[in-house]
């Protein structure tokens, strides 16, 4: 007897983090034997949509014309072949930005930092929020989360980095969010350029758990160090 059908691959274009009002296309890729594709959204009546495969039948397209809060969430897809339905795909988390006003991102003591020294990136929101995210441009896995304990609302989060190396240099933005839906983020902060000077061959930090933040073959881990921030937020790694 044949084993279970392989699970399809699910992805979003242009990406899974979409600004309010922008369009997004969700693709589900199965096999050439697929006869039908189905997309389910968590906490929505199933199926969210069904589509016939596009030639050569190994994938289907699901579309969102203009991103709103209602589309944010977790999706899975399946395909049906002559022998039955496939396993579900790995989940796709579709995140909408623009749900809240943008926070302010600053560097303490300065965005100009010498290699080996310390710097703290500070993300501040006008209204109290319970989750803050730091993103580095062109990062492979860019999300650094700070989430408050017990839903406590905070106006800011600190992302300390020490010791700073050349890999920490680059452009950062931050977002804020409420815990009731981590699929809804604020507008992005204005970009902050962190400039690291005085190093050619810096020692690289080697944390046990890291978030990769540089793109391509230069991928290096970025692990803010130091104590849990004063704001009462605990570090949460995605």
């Amino acid at each position: 007897q044949a084993g279970p059908l392989p699970k399809p691959t699910l992805w979003a274009e242009p990406g899974s983090v979409i600004s309010w009002g922008n369009s997004v296309t969700i693709w589900c890729q199965g096999t050439l034997e697929a006869r039908e594709y189905r997309l389910d959204k968590e906490e929505s009546p199933a199926p969210w949509d069904r589509q016939n495969p596009l030639e050569p039948k190994n994938k289907a397209r699901f579309s969102i014309p203009s991103m709103t809060e209602d589309y944010a969430g977790r999706y899975r897809c399946y395909y049906r072949s002559p022998v039955g339905w496939s396993q579900p795909s790995d989940p796709l988390e579709l995140v909408m930005t623009g749900a809240y006003s943008k926070p302010t991102l600053s560097a303490l003591p300065s965005p100009l930092v010498t290699s080996g020294k310390s710097v703290t990136l500070l993300c501040q929101s006008r209204s109290p929020m319970d989750t803050f995210l730091l993103i580095k441009e062109r990062a492979a896995h860019p999300l650094l989360h700070l989430r408050s304990e017990h839903g406590a609302q905070q106006h800011q989060a600190e992302f300390p980095m020490s010791p700073v190396t050349s890999v920490h240099g680059g452009t950062y933005r931050c977002f804020s969010s409420h815990g009731f839906s981590h699929y809804l983020l604020s507008h992005p902060s204005d970009p902050l350029e962190l400039i690291v000077s005085g190093s050619l061959e810096d020692p690289r930090p080697s944390p046990t758990r890291s978030v990769s933040t540089a793109a391509g073959p230069e991928d290096q881990p970025l692990m803010p160090t130091g104590s849990v921030p004063h704001s009462g937020l605990r570090r949460h790694w995605e």
Epitope: W48, R61, I64, S66
Partner: antibody, heavy 121, light 108 residues
Amino acid sequence: EQSVEESGGDLVKPGASLTLTCAASGFSFSSTYCMCWVRQAPGKGLEWIACIHGVSTNNRWYASWPKGRFTISKTSSTTVTLQMTSLTAADTATYFCARSDTDYEWGLSLWGPGTLVTISS
Amino acid sequence: ELDLTQTPASVSEPVGGTVTIKCQASESIGSRLAWYQQKPGQRPKLLIYKASTLASGVPSRFSGSGSGTEFTLTVSDLECADVAAYYCQCAGQSSTWAFGGGTEVEIK
């Protein structure tokens, strides 16, 4: 052959309500479509009213000018309605149903012939 | 609320001439702009989508350009069959499908 057709246009008095229906043929609604209503007063330009996503009934988009008087709804996998209340002479127009299509970057690729709504005492 | 300002309101050119219609958005809409042709007494017809892509069956005399807030529709080698009203439209960006005010094209 895919098509849409409007019905329900009528002559009604100011203050009345009216429901227009758009019936799709040759296709059924899915996430790759939105169904939209557009109107055109005599001798005037096109005016967008509302759109609804083919699968997500929570996602309805309205122009600001109807100020809650118009409601777009999906009543089946091939029909959409436009409920209009508190009608005035300014709502006299031909009302078009049109399909917004992901293949055309959400442009309105398929239009009905229109249905005439006249508001007069 | 997004506004689309279309100019001119009307234009008259001889057969074989070129008509240029501009559409300005009050905020950036990327390339989410469509152009429509509506002949007297008929339903509108999609001419161009994604700012510059011709819909199927549309002659190459029609062309669209622009992105962000400034867009242009050009009709070259004008024919009598091109007499119509032309409309620009934001196609769903920022949750609106708003139209411009329209341009009447006539033959001189």
